[in-house]
């Protein structure tokens, strides 16, 4: 922490400008008025302050706004945003997409995933829902950031907005997030023809249930292996060898490469070996011929 001293007369600060570059930490602490700093935040980013100096300026703002910064200050944080912790950001109320854009630009190239996730969360809360303008801003300025939102926040996405989401925006989404987004996508694209529908729904299929995957297998979609590997394990296990063959079409040969990886490995263990042999891929690990399969979980549920 910077020690408190009185400001020497020749160091008194009347405006935030480049003359502050060579101030020591204790001089900044003593001589910069927090209200002046807040009023002239838009100037800070043009001045080559060091990490240490930015720490002092942040401390000033923290003292002035213990409950969280106003958006007029947040919008102009610039590189000072890199000093913020998720705890700091949780105190903010952000509604402006211009603020979001400005801070997303600053965070680019820095390890700020936790801060960015919290910022986006605050924007969604501030705006009341994840509307089209917010999604457009995220996809333009922060590909992949959509997946930083919790399933709860994603549930506020109206289906009409789903069309603005690009495949690369979902690359880092986990199963719980896709579970929320998939039904919305299904609704959003329901009026599309088979092939067009598949192209649109494909990035969301990590959230699809078994019955929808089974339905796709009847539509000659030729699902690529990358998409298949992202399907929920629970959605893949009940599929028959015939259904998987129809689902993948010419891509079925890729199963051999993924033989040891989930969900393919788990699916193989559930299939009869002679069914797997019909694929001619040399897949091993299926249930040997003549063995009975007892599903104990069903019996336990009945007792």
């Amino acid at each position: 922490d910077v020690e408190r001293t009185t400001c020497p007369p020749e160091k008194e600060v009347h405006e935030i400008d480049e003359s502050l570059i060579f101030y020591k930490k204790r001089e900044l602490e003593a001589c910069v008025d927090a209200a002046l700093l807040a009023a002239q935040m838009d100037r800070v980013d043009a001045i080559p302050f060091t990490y240490e100096q930015l720490d002092v300026l942040k401390h000033k703002l923290d003292e002035l706004y213990p409950q969280g910064y106003p958006e007029s200050v947040i919008r102009h944080l610039g590189h000072l945003f890199l000093k913020m912790s998720p705890e700091d950001i949780r105190k903010w109320n952000v509604t402006s997409l211009e603020t979001l854009k400005a801070l997303l630009k600053v965070s680019k190239g820095h390890e700020m995933s936790a801060q960015v996730a919290t910022l986006i969360d605050r924007v969604v809360v501030g705006r009341g829902q994840l509307d089209k303008d917010t999604v457009d801003t995220l996809t333009a300025f922060c590909p992949g950031c959509l997946c930083s939102l919790s399933p709860e926040r994603l549930s506020s996405v109206p289906p009409s907005v789903i069309g603005a989401v690009r495949p690369q925006d979902l690359d880092t989404c986990g199963p719980r997030q896709l579970d929320v987004l998939y039904p919305k996508a299904r609704l959003a694209f329901q009026n599309m023809s088979g092939s067009e529908y598949f192209v649109k729904i494909r990035p969301f299929l990590g959230g699809a249930p078994t019955e929808d995957v089974k339905a796709l297998s009847q539509q000659n979609v030729s699902m690529d292996l990358a998409t298949f590997m992202k399907l929920r394990r629970e959605a893949v296990l009940p599929l028959t060898v015939a259904e998987v063959q129809k689902l993948l079409g010419p891509h079925v040969e890729g199963l051999k490469v993924e033989e040891q990886h989930s969900p393919v490995r788990d699916w193989i263990l559930k299939q009869r070996q002679d069914d797997l042999d019909t694929l001619g891929l040399g897949l091993q690990g299926g249930i040997p011929n003549g063995y009975l399969i007892l599903d104990l979980s069903v019996r336990e549920a009945l007792s």
Epitope: P8, E18, F22, Y23, K24, F49, T50, H79
Partner: antibody, heavy 119, light 106 residues
Framework: EFQLQQSGPELVKPGASVKISCKAS????????MNWVKQTNGKSLEWIGI????????SYNQKFKGKATLTVDQSSSTAYMQLNSLTSEDSAVYYC????????????WGQGTTLTVSS | QIVLTQSPAIMSASPGEKVTMTCSAS?????MYWYQQKPGSSPRLLIY???NLASGVPVRFSGSGSGTSYSLTISRMEAEDAATYYC?????????FGSGTELEIK
């Protein structure tokens, strides 16, 4: 060991531009601001400007605004100074110099780059 | 901008002799910095924040002063101290250097 290695001497014609480099090693380049200083005829020193290697923000002595442009390349830990519209007045030795922690002086200097502007 | 006037411009001292040079600022400054430069070499930081010795600088060097008047002292002159010494301020923007004091060995 901390080191600031500058590019070699330059002989250029009036009206031309030149870009001098300063490669940092032995410390975290983005943690310290970099300054540029001009020394004419082995006499006194003039501060040209300063750049923050982390953000690329810079500030200039009014006298050198429009004459000097400071940039950095983080990937190679190198600071650059471009001087344009050169005249004989720009002939000098130019130094890069790192600012110490909490503005405790220019603690490390490059070896200097001699610029001669002559037709 | 603040003008720093160094005096004397040139001086000489015998080995073992005490040497004092001054730097006068046109306006009050908070700190003074001192650099040593030998012919063909870069400046080297000697004193920072008026009186603190930079890393590797011999203890025979010391700095003092406040306001507009500052000084650099060498308690016992050695041959290797022959050089030009510059004061520098950055309390006021832009940073400025003095015109230098050239110290010769007698």
């Amino acid at each position: 060991e901390f080191q600031l290695q500058q590019s070699g001497p330059e002989l250029v014609k009036p009206g031309a531009s030149v870009k001098i480099s300063c490669k940092a090693s032995g410390y975290s380049f983005t943690d310290y601001n970099m300054n540029w200083v001009k020394q004419t005829n082995g006499k006194s020193l003039e501060w040209i400007g300063i750049i923050n290697p982390n953000y690329g923000t810079s500030s200039y002595n009014q006298k050198f605004k429009g004459k000097a442009t400071l940039t950095v390349d983080q990937s190679s830990s190198t600071a650059y100074m471009q001087l344009n519209s050169l005249t004989s007045e720009d002939s000098a030795v130019y130094y890069c110099a790192r600012v110490g922690r909490d503005n405790s002086g220019f603690d490390y200097w490059g070896q200097g780059t001699t610029l001669t502007v002559s037709s | 901008q603040i003008v720093l006037t160094q005096s004397p411009a040139i001086m000489s001292a015998s080995p073992g002799e005490k040497v004092t040079m001054t730097c006068s600022a046109s306006s009050s400054v908070s700190y003074m910095y001192w650099y040593q430069q030998k012919p063909g070499s870069s400046p080297r930081l000697l004193i920072y924040d008026t009186s603190n010795l930079a890393s590797g600088v011999p203890v025979r060097f010391s700095g003092s002063g406040s306001g507009t008047s500052y000084s650099l002292t060498i308690s016992r002159m050695e041959a290797e101290d022959a050089a030009t010494y510059y004061c520098q301020q950055w309390s006021s923007y832009p940073p400025t250097f003095g015109s230098g004091t050239e110290l010769e060995i007698k």
